[in-house]
């Protein structure tokens, strides 16, 4: 069915069920952010995966305690990051299944790019990351 | 042109349910999604969900999903909403909107014991 | 929820000078095709409402050219050039792009 362009039709692309967002985050060093996945069911449990490189598959993000924190309410799925690092660059992606179907939906994604480097060897890596 | 008509108003009892209809005429039934919109007295409006009639496909709000079913009957391209369990602050205005386009004239639905 | 906040709450405007409403998201509206699903309508006292804007800017057919949406983001605007009589009502800025669709709290635009 036609949305008349009015709102986002959940019929409308791959990434339609799941909906992620901001889709970049720029923070300096220290500072906490937040990610947001809105889904149009909330009949499943929402995870999230992080890759560092745009080649790579991501992978379950192991969640280090006191300073991630996942939480979930209804349809909306918040992963906070407190004091960042360097190597917490990359994109994070939150994934949900479906308690009754089983299948697995997956959000587009959020790049984190960590400002702030304070030696040259990480200023290098940093330009080399792919964009 | 396209038209929406909903169903008279209604006076229900705590608990008790409501059906609303909203017969569409002047366009295809099944292109467009279905919306529900609420609003009450003096208040701001709340999206409740929405369907396709096509294939009955529905996407409710969190804040009614387990009150609310939204269905249409495609032989006479009618949508129904029905809420269910009422309390007094589901007293409002139910509003059909053809893809939040296109708005019904209302139904006024009053919860009172 | 996409929380849409909107002001001011009451707008009393002179015929033929212009009005500006404010209309700010609690998240980016920007979709990941592009599309930034904000928009208005206007319900005039004891009507049902009627579309004013989709998209942004983008009028719906029949809609004067006086009225006009700008905006990105998370803040956008809503602007009548030269007041009407007509254009008495409450204004509402809502958005299509998080589920469950919210809407903004309402501006009501009056005659000074």
């Known amino acids: 069915a036609r949305s008349e362009d009015r709102y986002r039709n959940p019929k409308g692309s791959a990434c339609s069920r799941i909906w992620q967002s901001p889709r970049f985050i720029a923070r300096k060093r220290g500072f906490t952010v937040k990610m947001h996945c809105y889904m149009n069911s909330a009949s499943g449990n929402v995870s999230w995966l992080w890759k560092q490189e745009m080649d790579e598959n991501p992978q379950q993000l192991k969640l280090e305690k006191g300073r991630m924190e996942e939480s979930q309410n209804e349809s909306l799925a918040t992963l906070t990051i407190q004091g960042i690092r360097f190597e917490d660059n990359g994109i994070y992606f939150c994934q949900q299944k479906c308690n009754n179907t089983s299948e697995v939906y997956q959000g587009c994604g959020t790049e984190l790019r960590v400002m702030g480097f304070s030696t040259l060897a990480q200023l290098k890596q940093r330009n080399t990351l792919k964009d | 042109q396209v038209q929406l008509v909903q169903s008279g108003a209604e006076v229900k009892k705590p608990g008790a349910s409501v059906k609303v209809s909203c017969k569409a005429s002047?366009?295809?039934?099944?292109?467009?999604?279905m919306n529900w919109v609420r609003q009450a007295p003096g208040q701001g409006l709340t999206w409740m969900g929405m369907?396709?009639?096509?294939?009955?496909?529905?996407h409710y709000n969190h804040l009614f999903k387990d009150r609310v079913t939204m269905t249409v009957d495609k032989s006479t391209s009618t949508a129904y909403m029905e809420l269910s369990s009422l309390r007094s602050e589901d007293t409002a205005v139910y509003y059909c909107?053809?893809?939040?386009?296109?708005w019904g004239q209302g139904t006024l639905v009053t919860v009172s014991s | 929820d996409v929380v849409m906040t909107q002001s001011p709450l009451s707008l009393p405007v002179t015929l033929g000078q212009p009005a500006s409403i404010s209309c700010k998201s609690s998240?980016?509206?920007?979709?990941?095709?592009?599309?930034?699903?904000l928009n208005w309508f206007q319900q005039r006292p004891g009507q049902s409402p009627r579309p004013l804007i989709s998209?942004?800017?983008k009028l719906d057919s029949g809609v004067p050219d006086r009225f006009s949406g700008s905006g990105s983001g998370t803040d956008f605007t809503l602007k009548i050039s030269r007041v009407e009589a007509e254009d008495v009502g409450v204004y509402y800025c809502?958005?299509?792009?998080?589920?469950?669709?919210?809407f903004g709290g309402g501006t009501k635009v009056e005659i000074k």
């Open positions: 998209l942004v800017s």
């Open positions: 909107t053809r893809a939040i386009g296109y």
């Open positions: 809502w958005q299509g792009t998080h589920f469950p669709l919210t």
């Open positions: 002047g366009y295809s039934f099944t292109t467009y999604w």
């Open positions: 998240l980016s509206l920007l979709d990941s095709e592009g599309k930034t699903y």
């Open positions: 369907i396709d009639p096509s294939d009955s496909e529905t």
